[in-house]
């Protein structure tokens, strides 16, 4: 997260760290007791490593009573996701067992009504992604409030030049932005999960390259079918 601040500890009990061989790789969001939603491209970076999900964490390194690392029973990328595009960049991870719920671990309601968030709406994005262009990684969860950007502006040639589909949304990126390592994390508007940070090599913090988020409402049928 660029231009953000440290989050209030455990105030986002849905927040997950998707880890490979014990290292944070991507963000994720607990959407059901045994399921974490993340970004499909995160699996590509995992190679053959052991994928696990950390829940109930604020600090990645310090012991915390609520922290627990779960093995992944099943990884289900969206069937249409492909390495060369950010389309359908969603991944569902089934935990090896149901998460132990409590004040620091709780699923987040996700948007099912397929309607665009009003441009200008302030939404919260959180993650353990880099906090500087130099690539500094934070130990504690960071967050930032970002205004939603209308799709027409996001599709301008100097922004994303027509790449933003109806199944994506954008948020402003003027110095405050999601960045590398935040992929798969939640974009939360009015207490509801609206978007998932897409993965990719997008430049961060440049206002002409807005953050791109996969709209979960657009994938309600798929999510329901996997969770069923």
């Amino acid at each position: 997260i660029l231009g953000g601040r440290e989050a209030e500890a455990h105030a986002r009990p849905y927040m997950a760290s998707v880890q490979v061989n014990g290292e944070h790789l991507c963000g994720g969001v607990l959407v059901a007791e045994q399921w974490v939603l993340s970004a499909a491209h995160c699996l590509e970076d995992a190679a053959d490593g052991k994928v696990q999900v950390l829940l109930g964490a604020h600090s990645l390194s310090q012991p915390e009573p609520s922290k627990r690392l779960y093995d992944v029973l099943r990884a289900v990328p969206h069937p249409d996701s492909r390495p060369d595009t950010i389309d359908h960049d969603l991944l569902l991870l089934q935990l090896s067992e149901k998460a132990t719920l409590g004040p620091a671990v709780r699923p987040l309601p996700w948007q099912r009504v397929d309607r665009d968030v009003e441009p200008g709406t302030l939404c919260d994005v959180a993650g353990w992604g880099i906090v500087s262009h130099a690539g500094r990684r934070p130990d504690r969860l960071q967050h930032v409030l970002l205004p939603v950007l209308d799709r027409a502006t996001c599709n301008r040639r100097t922004h994303h030049d027509g790449a933003i589909t109806q199944r994506m949304m954008c948020a402003e990126s003027n110095r405050r932005d999601s960045c590398k390592g935040d992929s798969g994390g939640p974009l939360v508007c009015g207490g509801v999960l609206e978007g998932v940070v897409t993965s990719g090599s997008r430049v961060c913090g440049n206002r002409k390259k807005p953050g791109i988020y996969t709209r979960v409402a657009s994938y309600a049928a798929w999510i329901d079918s996997v969770l069923a």
């Epitope: 209308d150 799709r151 027409a152 502006t153 040639r157 100097t158 030049d161 027509g162 430049v203 440049n206």
Partner: antibody, heavy 116, light 112 residues
Framework: EVQLQQSGPELVKPGASVKISCKAS????????MNWVKQSHGKSLEWIGD????????SCNQKFKGKATLTVDKSSSTAYMELRSLTSGDSAVYYC?????????WGQGTLVTVSA | DVLMTQTPLSLPVSLGDQASISCRSS???????????LEWYLQKPGQSPKLLIY???NRFSGVPDRFSGSGSGTDFTLKISRVEAEDLGVYYC?????????FGAGTKLELK
Amino acid sequence: EVQLQQSGPELVKPGASVKISCKASGYTFTDHYMNWVKQSHGKSLEWIGDINPNNGGTSCNQKFKGKATLTVDKSSSTAYMELRSLTSGDSAVYYCTREGASFAFWGQGTLVTVSA
Amino acid sequence: DVLMTQTPLSLPVSLGDQASISCRSSQSIVHSNGDTYLEWYLQKPGQSPKLLIYKVSNRFSGVPDRFSGSGSGTDFTLKISRVEAEDLGVYYCFQGSHVPVTFGAGTKLELK
């Protein structure tokens, strides 16, 4: 399939105004800016301005300030350009073109002829 | 405004020839985001312009690979490796990095 269908040719008198239309189909109208371009006979292309269909916000080439007014009607997915105080120098083909990807999609053009 | 100067204004060719069109901008068209929004369009008589190349060297979908774009900063080139009859028309370079966006005067590719 993305299509931009423009209104037909116009023959107008000097000093009058004309409003030409560009009806979009094959995509969500509010997802892309609409731009307008002028091409005088046998000449190059000149950018007039653009409009964000979400909020009607416009940006205009200084050269066309006071000459062109851009509007949209979201309900019919149609962009409009009104040209006022017409002179012979405004006789041209006017194109609408969708922004993103680049200017990949153009209307067929509307010929405006200004003549007494 | 950024002036886009194309040379030559007329380019007589024989079918199968290689053709090269130059475009020079009056100032750098590298955008503040690091990208260069230099595009090439082809307009055939009685038709609307068609996008060929975007961001200097990227062919738009469906554009044959005999078309290639190159250049940087202020100097850009469009090359057609083997001219076919359907390639004849007026070629325009365009910059989208600075407002107002501007087109070159055009280069007419015609048969000798």
